[in-house]
């Protein structure tokens, strides 16, 4: 299934894009997957479809579920799925992992924090920014367009940053928040040429046809916060995003720190419903930092 995960908070606006690529003006129909009931396009409804976009104004926990979008044309239709989860607002300041967008890293030279998903909304500047739930104040913080710039970044600037903005739809305003972690390059730390812990180079993994399997790419880059440290999978030398096989999905890298202080990153490649053709692909685990690139290759074989 060609699907995409989206999440939001109750009583906030959530806008989801159909995962099937299409241009503006294409005809897109949306349905509740469970009931096959069409989602209305009239803007007076709390949940309505607007071309490529599905709008929850505002979202409710009960909206959680899978939504089907069909890019229609007179001779050829394309179907995608949006997996939407709406969470209750947290009573305390803690933002759980499942509400976090991808982590960004910064340094004294580069401290931009982009507000996730904001491009989907009709918003006007300025954004409000919070760190660990406290409103950011002072001349060091500059809200610029859709990102936050921090001057003279220090290690204690690391933390969870939330952007808050107002989405306007036909004169009505809806709040939206999005949170992501910001890490700061630790001057006391150091970085090394990447070391891939798993998989071993030229490893072969046995899999069952029709089953699901996970491949973990795990690499370490040195001690302390790393300015650039990415771990990703490639298929036959292509990025996963370029390959666009919906059964094969790469999770965002998870940062890990070991007792010896090593900064490591794990990225999991999930392969659903393993097919014969997957056995012919070359799976490359790539670890990249400022020192260079290391690659370990793994192949799949039938059990």
């Amino acid at each position: 299934k060609f699907s995409k995960q989206s999440w939001g908070l109750e009583n906030e606006a959530l806008i989801v894009r159909c995962p099937r690529q299409g241009k503006s003006s294409y005809i897109v129909d949306w349905y509740y997957s469970q009931t096959n009931k069409s989602i209305p396009t009239q803007e007076r409804n709390r949940v309505f479809a607007s071309g490529q976009l599905l709008k929850f104004l505002p979202a409710e926990v009960a909206d959680s579920g899978i939504y089907t979008c069909i890019v229609r044309s007179p001779t050829f239709n394309r179907t995608g799925y949006a997996n939407v989860t709406i969470y209750k607002k947290q009573p305390d300041c803690n933002v759980p992992d499942y509400l976090m967008y991808s982590t960004v890293s910064g340094s004294e030279k580069n401290s931009k924090i982009y507000c996730p998903t904001i491009d989907l909304y009709n918003w006007t500047a300025p954004l409000e920014w919070f760190k660990n739930c406290q409103a950011l104040q002072g001349s060091r913080y500059k809200a610029h367009k859709s990102f936050l710039v921090i001057d003279n970044v220090m290690t204690d600037d690391a933390g969870d940053y939330t952007c808050k903005f107002i989405h306007n739809e036909n004169g009505a305003n809806y709040s939206v928040t999005a949170t992501r972690s910001f890490t700061v390059k630790d001057e006391q730390g150091f970085s090394l040429f990447p070391v891939i812990r798993a998989p071993a180079h030229n490893e072969t993994k046995e899999v069952e046809i029709g089953e699901n399997t996970n491949l973990t790419c795990s690499a370490c880059f040195g001690k302390g916060a790393q300015f650039l440290a990415t771990v990703q999978w490639q298929l036959n030398g292509n990025k996963i995003t370029d390959f666009s096989e919906p059964r094969i999905q790469q999770e965002e890298g998870q940062n890990q720190s070991f007792s010896n202080g090593l900064a490591c990153v794990n990225t999991v490649l999930r392969i659903a419903d393993v097919k014969e053709e997957d056995l012919l692909l070359r799976y490359d685990c790539l670890a990249l930092n400022l020192h260079g690139l290391r690659r370990h290759t793994i192949r799949l074989s039938r059990k």
Partner: antibody, heavy 117, light 111 residues
Framework: EVQLQESGPGLVKPSQSLSLTCTVT?????????WNWIRQFPGSKLEWMGF???????SFNPSLKSRISVTRDTSKNQFFLQLNSVTTEDTATYYC??????????WGQGTTLTVSS | DIVLTQSPASLAISLGQRATISCRAS??????????MFWYQQKPGQPPKLLIY???NLESGVPARFSGSGSGTDFTLNIHPVEEEDAAAYYC?????????FGGGTKLEIK
């Protein structure tokens, strides 16, 4: 980035079958789009021939239906054109192209085919 | 089959002037509020490149001097102001039904 590349024999004798291959890189042909064959005759006229969709469904130009087939090899991310009983009228540049239900977005560079004895 | 007739077959336009190319369909290519007409540019030795989709929408990366209009059976591609690099052949194409067909093409020469 999606890239398509046609390959074929260049020269075919009349009454024989023509087989062309389109190799797609940067995108899986089973994940989206319809994968088409389009030809351009020496006078520049363009003709859509047929497609195979991401799900494996096919559709053909009725003018060619009796002698065309489009198949694929998902393990190699390739799709193929077979045209039977060719005549000199089938001399053309053959393009493969992706189709999103609306327009042909990505095209190969084309391969020239001459039908001659 | 829907026959697309392009006119003129060729035209020569001075730099900075307007080029207008017409495409007429033998039956309507519009349905449910959308016109399934597309325009492509082709330069020698290259495949066609999409310029305009759904009659009037500019494809990403295409200069704003290209514009499309029309509905039903009559469609127009305009280029203004014409530039040196616009010398090429232009084709209309419909996707209203199978078979998809193309117009005969219009060759634009820059004077």
């Amino acid at each position: 980035e999606v890239q398509l590349q046609e390959s074929g024999p260049g020269l075919v004798k009349p009454s024989q079958s023509l087989s062309l291959t389109c190799t797609v890189t940067g995108f899986s042909i089973t994940s989206d789009y319809a994968w088409n064959w389009i030809r351009q005759f020496p006078g520049s006229k363009l003709e859509w021939m047929g497609f195979i969709s991401y799900s494996g469904d096919t559709s053909f130009n009725p003018s060619l239906k009796s002698r065309i087939s489009v198949t694929r090899d998902t393990s190699k991310n390739q799709f193929f054109l077979q045209l039977n009983s060719v005549t000199t009228e089938d001399t053309a540049t053959y393009y493969c192209a992706s189709y999103d239900g609306y327009s042909f977005d990505y095209w190969g560079q084309g391969t020239t085919l001459t039908v001659s004895s | 089959d829907i026959v697309l007739t392009q006119s003129p077959a060729s035209l020569a336009i001075s730099l900075g002037q307007r080029a207008t190319i017409s495409c007429r369909a033998s039956k309507s290519v519009s349905t449910s509020g959308s016109s399934y007409m597309f325009w492509y540019q082709q330069k020698p030795g290259q495949p066609p490149k999409l310029l305009i989709y759904l009659a009037s929408n500019l494809e990403s990366g295409v200069p704003a001097r290209f514009s499309g209009s029309g509905s039903g059976t009559d469609f127009t591609l305009n280029i203004h102001p014409v530039e040196e690099e616009d010398a090429a052949a232009y084709y209309c194409q419909h996707s209203r039904e199978i078979p998809y067909t193309f117009g005969g093409g219009t060759k634009l020469e820059i004077k």
